[in-house]
């Protein structure tokens, strides 16, 4: 004969546990129904009556089957640095992530608590390590034979053009100027080639930044006490 299905509330057999989506109420000493996501326990069960559930109020939620007396408050509205990637509903919390050009400086369980602008490398410096969702850009000085003439959070150092006849030699922040009509591009020694991130959101590769001397302004550092890459500017 099949075992008789017990309806909540019921007293569990000694040594057994309550079934899925049920909880053991210490006061009633009974197995009682949990409330579904989007609801909370309005009235706890007794020996003779089951849990009474009620819908979460506006701006509150429960994500799991539960028996909490009150729903959880949704997080505060996303700041101007952020975009709302998941709205606050009765069943899920709001999730804020950083908008393009920003990264998450202070993370939380889901989403981001504080977004910061990605560092921009100034002319003479290129991106050594692209920004990711949770880390800043690392800049490095352009090596001999390479240059960057932009203030950018994505541009790397590019090789100088090779001239038949040089009008103006290139430097770290300027390309060479040729007098010849047909310059040729060459891979100069020390040229840096990094994948350019399409979006900071899905960029997770982190090439190791080359060490450099400390600049005269402050920087977000790579890990550890080593000196930072220089060449950052504000946003």
């Amino acid at each position: 004969l099949p075992a008789q299905v017990a309806f909540t509330p019921y007293a569990p057999e000694p040594g057994s546990t309550c079934r899925l989506r049920e909880y053991y109420d210490q006061t009633a000493q009974m197995c009682c129904s949990k409330c579904s996501p989007g609801q909370h326990a309005k009235v706890f069960c007794t020996k003779t009556s089951d849990t009474v559930c009620d819908s979460c109020e506006d701006s509150t939620y429960t994500q799991l089957w539960n028996w909490v007396p009150e729903c959880l408050s949704c997080g505060s509205r996303c700041s101007s640095d952020q975009v709302e990637t998941q709205a606050c509903t009765r069943e899920q919390n709001r999730i804020c992530t950083c908008r393009p050009g920003w990264y998450c400086a202070l993370s939380k369980q889901e989403g981001c608590r504080l977004c910061a602008p990605l560092r921009k490398c100034r002319p003479g410096f290129g991106v050594a390590r692209p920004g990711t969702e949770t880390s800043d850009v690392v800049c490095k000085p352009c090596a001999p034979g390479t240059f960057s003439n932009t203030t950018s959070s994505t541009d790397i150092c590019r090789p100088h053009q090779i001239c038949n006849v040089v009008a103006i030699p290139g430097n770290a922040s300027m390309d060479a100027v040729c007098t010849s009509t047909s310059p040729t591009r060459s891979m100069a020694p020390g040229a840096v080639h990094l994948p350019q991130p399409v979006s900071t959101r899905s960029q997770h590769t982190q090439p190791t930044p080359e060490p450099s001397t400390a600049p005269s302004t402050s920087f977000l550092l790579p890990m550890g006490p080593s000196p930072p890459a220089e060449g950052s500017t504000g946003d």
Epitope: S107, K108, C115, T233, G234
Partner: antibody, heavy 121, light 110 residues
């Protein structure tokens, strides 16, 4: 009660090292950025360093490459490892919590009482 | 020399209104919010005004902050003897990627 308590200060010779600690209580430590701000005797306030999550740390120009900020969220503690100390690093070092509603709206809302670091031979 | 410029001293008599100025640049005050800190003699600094003009709970409404362009100011009305302290302005500087403070203003209540 929200509280920050610094320790680890003392007398050290030029070129020496010191590690400051800041024990936090009364709030969810990993919800906040944390900073060190110093004040030389009779002088004004000077920002030293700020740390957010993980390795997201910022440093002032005068300490970069010598000081390292870190945090242990499991111990609710902020640290400042100070190497290659100089006489001009002599100051009271304050630990401060960073309130932030957005990047442009941040402030040091809670301060510790400070710990004195003296660099002298 | 401090990045933000404050007068080294200010004074007033009880009941008076006193204003302390703080001058900066487009990379700090103009593009970020300004905070003011009060440091009573022998104590740690305390946040007085944040986000240009917001008062933390517990700070009397006698204290107010304002900002215009690259300058900010702190006003204290109904001056009291217990307001005698050092006052510092501070802001994030985008060019330096760091916090900058004013040199501090010593307020004396005559």
């Amino acid at each position: 009660e929200v509280q920050l308590l610094e320790s680890g200060g003392g007398l050290v010779q030029p070129g020496g090292s010191l590690r400051l600690s800041c024990a936090a209580s009364g709030f969810t430590f990993d919800d906040y950025g944390m900073s060190w701000v110093r004040q030389a005797p009779g002088k004004g306030l000077e920002w030293v360093s700020t740390i957010y999550s993980g390795d997201n740390a910022y440093y002032g120009a005068s300490v970069r490459g010598r000081f390292t900020i870190s945090r242990d969220n499991s111990k609710n503690t902020l640290y400042l490892q100070m190497n290659s100390l100089r006489a001009e690093d002599t100051a009271v070092y304050y630990c401060a919590r960073v309130y932030s509603s957005s990047w442009r709206k941040r402030a040091f809302d809670i301060w510790g009482q400070g710990t004195l670091v003296t660099v002298s031979s | 020399q401090s990045v933000l410029t404050q007068p080294p001293s200010a004074s007033g008599t009880p009941g008076q209104r006193v204003t302390i100025s703080c001058s900066g640049t487009s990379s700090n005050i103009e593009s970020n919010t300004v905070n003011w800190y009060q440091q009573l003699p022998g104590t740690a600094p305390k946040l007085l005004i944040y986000s240009d003009n917001q008062r933390p709970s517990g700070v009397p409404d006698r204290f107010s902050g304002s900002k215009s362009g690259t300058s900010a100011s702190l006003a204290i009305s109904g001056l009291r003897s217990e307001d005698e302290a050092d006052y510092y302005c501070a802001a994030w500087d985008d060019s330096l990627s760091g916090w900058v403070f004013g040199g501090g203003t010593k307020l004396t209540v005559l």
